[in-house]
Interface confidence: low
């Protein structure tokens, strides 16, 4: 009897299930939380997509708990955000805490759960569009007219507290054009645009984005008619062209007029240090440009020659107070590239401030929407603006004045000061990274042991940076290129202030023949340009040891007095034995260290590279 009842029950259940399945009645499909957004870090809303309803009425509920807490809660408000949403009011929103949430779908046949979503309010901010967009054509006298754009931040956002940093982007296009022209405005709430087509009607929009989070929608378009006479006065144009042409002509004439060594010293200021490539006089006379460039250290890295095979070198010292060290390329493109701008021309290498964690925004140390836990709850949505040509990392852009912090590939952040013309100091530092790298390793033939681990990478990237930089015109593009390619650990070398020392009457010119293995400089008198060909170096009778510095000539040539007794050579050797080299060095540098180790006072530390202070030598020789 019992068996019959049991079998009947089982049969009834199976029949019921079969009927349900035939009627298409199933448990609900798995829902998915696809998007969470906050307009202002004070409230936020999440939306989900229902799964299949199983052919039955389905109820959805969102439950959540906060990281580190065990209490489970249900969504406080299913209404405000519309269908399939959960809105968290101020009372339920907290910054810097992770919400772990899931959606439960239930019908008569059962229930299913979404995957858990990890949400940090900080990273889901999407502000409302900026307000009060005003556009105006400005036509100042004798200057190019421009479009002036102004706007206000969205009302929900309190910028005064510093709780929020908003970045803005402007886009504009002629009414009938297909493509938008996009300009990044940083934190400014106004912007000038110069390059516009006269007689066209333009659409202008602006949007904003917090330091972390998403771009707002574009503001409603504002239309502006560009006048047909939106060009500079013809006379102004012609005057500009004429002046420019005159300047170019003068430069060419001057360059052609100057010959030989004087031309070289003007165009390529001397670089300090004992192992700097000079020029063979033959090169200048015969005009072998390739060899000349090679001598200037312009060849590719790494060096192929041993130090013994180097060209004849000159020891040159800069005695001017206001002229800083510059690498040989520095005048080729002084206006290009990133210029690290410092208000004080101090003697700090800048390295410390590159690495100092206190200088970097704390935000930079936060996870970049931590891929393991914070999946982007908008993966299914199309990007809002596929036409946008660049993406600003939501993580690491934090404007302080006009110095943004950019993400440099890893979790570190790099500080790259933007070019700020108003602050440019007459004694500004190196013009680009390549120059720094080339100075750091010395001439191409010199061993490159200065650079730290990451600094070595800078050498590889310096060529690409140089070639990329030369074509860049706007700050924005510079910023973008550095955003993507700069290396945090590239050392910034700042030039030392020169110690002035008195120059005496010139006695002789000298050439460094070589650095002996025992550490002494082998020097020989240099023939004057007009006295015919110089004697070939290497002839024994010409090799003299010099030990006294008499003075420095006007054009920064170090003048040494021959010492027949060569007493000081021994002194060099003695002091060399006592002074350990400051860096791991190869043979050439050890020899060089012997020479430079005369006195600890005679070294100027520059980002790890040793420089000779001629003032010191003057004292030690006398």
């Amino acid at each position: 009897m019992k068996e019959n009842v049991a079998s009947a029950t089982v049969f009834t259940l199976l029949l019921f299930l079969n009927t349900c399945l035939l009627n298409g009645q199933l448990p609900p499909g798995k829902p998915e939380i696809f998007k969470c957004r906050s307009p202002n870090k004070e409230t936020f809303t999440c939306w989900w997509r229902p799964g299949t309803d199983g052919g039955l009425p389905t109820n959805y509920s969102l439950t959540y708990h906060r990281e580190g807490e065990t209490l489970m809660h249900e969504c406080p408000d299913y209404i405000t955000g519309g269908p399939n949403s959960c809105h968290f009011g101020k009372q339920y929103t907290s910054m810097w805490r992770t919400y772990i949430m899931m959606v439960n779908a239930t019908n008569q046949m059962g229930s299913s759960f979404s995957d858990e979503l990890y949400v940090d309010v900080t990273y889901i901010v999407q502000p409302d569009p900026p307000l009060e967009l005003a556009v105006e054509v400005k036509q100042p006298e004798d200057r190019k007219p421009y479009l002036w754009i102004k706007w206000s931040p969205p009302t929900l956002i309190d910028l005064k507290t510093g709780w929020f940093t908003l970045l803005y982007e402007i886009r504009l296009k002629p009414e009938k054009a297909a493509e938008w022209e996009i300009h990044f405005a940083g934190q400014q709430t106004e912007f000038k645009i110069l390059s516009l087509h006269p007689g066209q009607k333009y659409l202008v929009q602006v949007r904003c984005k917090p330091d972390h989070g998403y771009w707002s929608a574009w503001s409603p378009a504002t239309f502006i008619q560009i006048p047909s006479d939106f060009t500079m006065n013809d006379t102004t144009v012609w005057i500009s062209v004429a002046v420019l042409s005159a300047v170019i002509c003068l430069i060419i004439v001057w360059a052609v007029a100057l010959k030989g060594y004087s031309m070289v010293t003007c165009i390529f200021p001397p670089v300090p240090g004992p192992k700097i490539k000079g020029f063979d006089a033959h090169l200048l006379e015969k005009g072998k440009s390739e060899e000349l460039l090679s001598a200037l250290g312009c060849q590719d890295f790494p060096p192929t020659s041993d130090y013994e095979d180097l060209l004849v070198e000159y020891l040159e010292v800069d005695d001017s107070e206001d002229q800083h060290l510059m690498s040989v390329h520095s005048k080729e493109h002084p206006s290009q590239g990133m210029k690290p701008t410092y208000l004080d021309p101090d003697t700090d290498s800048g390295r410390g401030s590159c690495d100092s964690p206190s200088l970097l925004s704390e935000k930079c140390e936060e996870p970049q929407a931590n891929p393991s836990t914070f999946y982007d709850p908008e993966v299914i949505e199309k990007p809002e603006n596929p036409e946008t040509t660049h993406t600003w990392d939501p993580q690491c852009i934090s404007m302080e004045g006009k110095i943004p912090y950019f993400h440099a590939g890893g979790s570190k952040c790099s500080t790259w000061p933007l070019p700020q013309p108003s602050q440019h100091n007459p004694r500004s530092s190196y013009h680009n990274i390549t120059d720094v790298c080339e100075l750091a390793v010395g001439p191409a033939g010199a061993p490159a042991t200065l650079l730290n681990e990451a600094g070595k990478d800078a050498l590889k990237s310096s060529q690409t940076i140089k070639s990329r930089e030369e074509g860049k015109a706007t700050q924005q593009r510079e910023v973008e290129s550095f955003h993507s390619e700069t290396d945090q650990d590239t050392p910034w070398l700042l030039p030392q202030e020169k110690t002035p020392f008195g120059s005496a009457k010139p006695l002789d010119y000298v050439e460094i023949h070589k650095v002996n293995k025992d550490g002494a400089l082998s020097l020989l008198p240099k023939q004057r340009e007009n006295s015919g060909k110089p004697k070939k170096p290497g002839t024994p009778e010409n090799n003299k040891e010099y030990a006294k510095v008499s003075g420095v000539m006007d054009n920064n040539i170090l003048v040494l007095v021959p010492d027949p007794h060569a007493k000081n050579v021994a002194c060099f050797e003695e002091s060399a034995k006592e002074a350990p080299p400051s860096l791991e060095q190869n043979q050439a540098e050890k020899a060089l260290a012997n020479f430079t180790a005369t006195s600890s006072k005679c070294r100027l530390q520059l980002g790890g590279l040793d420089y000779l202070d001629p003032a010191c030598f003057t004292h030690s020789f006398h």
């Epitope: 109820n59 959805y60 509920s61 906060r66 580190g68 807490e69 209490l71 489970m72 809660h73 249900e74 969504c75 406080p76 408000d77 299913y78 209404i79 009011g89 009372q91 339920y92 929103t93 907290s94 805490r97």
Partner: antibody, heavy 121, light 113 residues
Framework: EVQLVESGGGLVQPGGSLRLSCAAS????????MTWVRQAPGKGLEWVSA????????YYADSVKGRFTISRDNSKNTLYLQMNSLGAEDTAEYYC??????????????WGRGTLVTVSS | DIVMTQSPDSLAVSLGARATINCKSS????????????LTWYQQKPGQPPKLLIK???TRESGVPDRFSGSGSGTDFTLTISSLQAEDVAVYYC?????????FGQGTKLEIK
């Protein structure tokens, strides 16, 4: 006027059933969680059950779990409490109360006048 | 479940005097993330339903006289009536709404001495 009015209370024998109703007016009923609270004669307040806003997720005190069922009809602005297997310990004044938010974890900012349920043989 | 314990069970205070009622929860009802205590105080007069006095442990409900104040955080809370009036005679209940079941304290009966 914002108010809650309970009904359906009365005398019932042990093991019997009763269905309480709470008619809401003066606010958007579906936007708020609703709660039943009871108070035995001369005793304190006891939270019985709650239901969330539009979705209708339900929560119960251990003492009534499996016997009581809370439900709501948002189209009628009415809250219900179906009470089965009643015992003498269920004798109490039953209050219907409105939560201040959509979910149940909110304070109760509006109370009905209550309906008395007496379980006695 | 979170257990709420009120003390004293009853309290007699002179008119115009200060009355203090305590409430202790077995677990913290403070959410550190939003710094809110999920605790409320109700007043129930004889023959009437309860009335909301204080929400979020210390926020007075609109229309409630300012002689009523709530304080405390975590597990220990206090309701204070700074100057007792005749109409304040009632039973006072605390309730936590941090975690279901949303439990009440057993109540404190306040009388005039």
């Amino acid at each position: 006027e914002v108010q809650l009015v309970e009904s359906g209370g009365g005398l019932v024998q042990p093991g019997g059933s009763l269905r309480l109703s709470c008619a809401a007016s003066g606010f958007t009923f579906s936007s708020y969680a609703m709660t039943w609270v009871r108070q035995a004669p001369g005793k304190g307040l006891e939270w019985v059950s709650a239901i969330t806003g539009s979705v209708g997720n339900t929560y119960y005190a251990d003492s009534v779990k499996g016997r009581f069922t809370i439900s709501r009809d948002n189209s009628k602005n009415t809250l219900y409490l179906q009470m089965n297997s009643l015992g003498a310990e269920d004798t109490a004044e039953y209050y219907c109360a409105k939560g201040a938010g959509m979910t149940t974890n909110w304070y109760l900012d509006l109370w009905g006048r209550g309906t008395l349920v007496t379980v006695s043989s | 479940d979170i257990v709420m314990t009120q003390s004293p069970d009853s309290l007699a205070v002179s008119l115009g005097a200060r009355a203090t009622i305590n409430c202790k929860s077995s677990q913290s009802v403070l959410y550190s993330s939003n710094n809110q205590n999920y605790l409320t105080w109700y007043q129930q007069k004889p023959g009437q339903p309860p009335k909301l006095l204080i929400k979020w442990a210390s926020t007075r409900e609109s229309g409630v006289p300012d002689r009523f104040s709530g304080s405390g955080s975590g597990t220990d809370f206090t309701l204070t009536i700074s100057s007792l009036q005749a109409e304040d005679v009632a039973v006072y209940y605390c309730q936590q709404y941090a975690s279901s079941p949303y439990t009440f304290g057993q109540g404190t009966k306040l009388e005039i001495k």
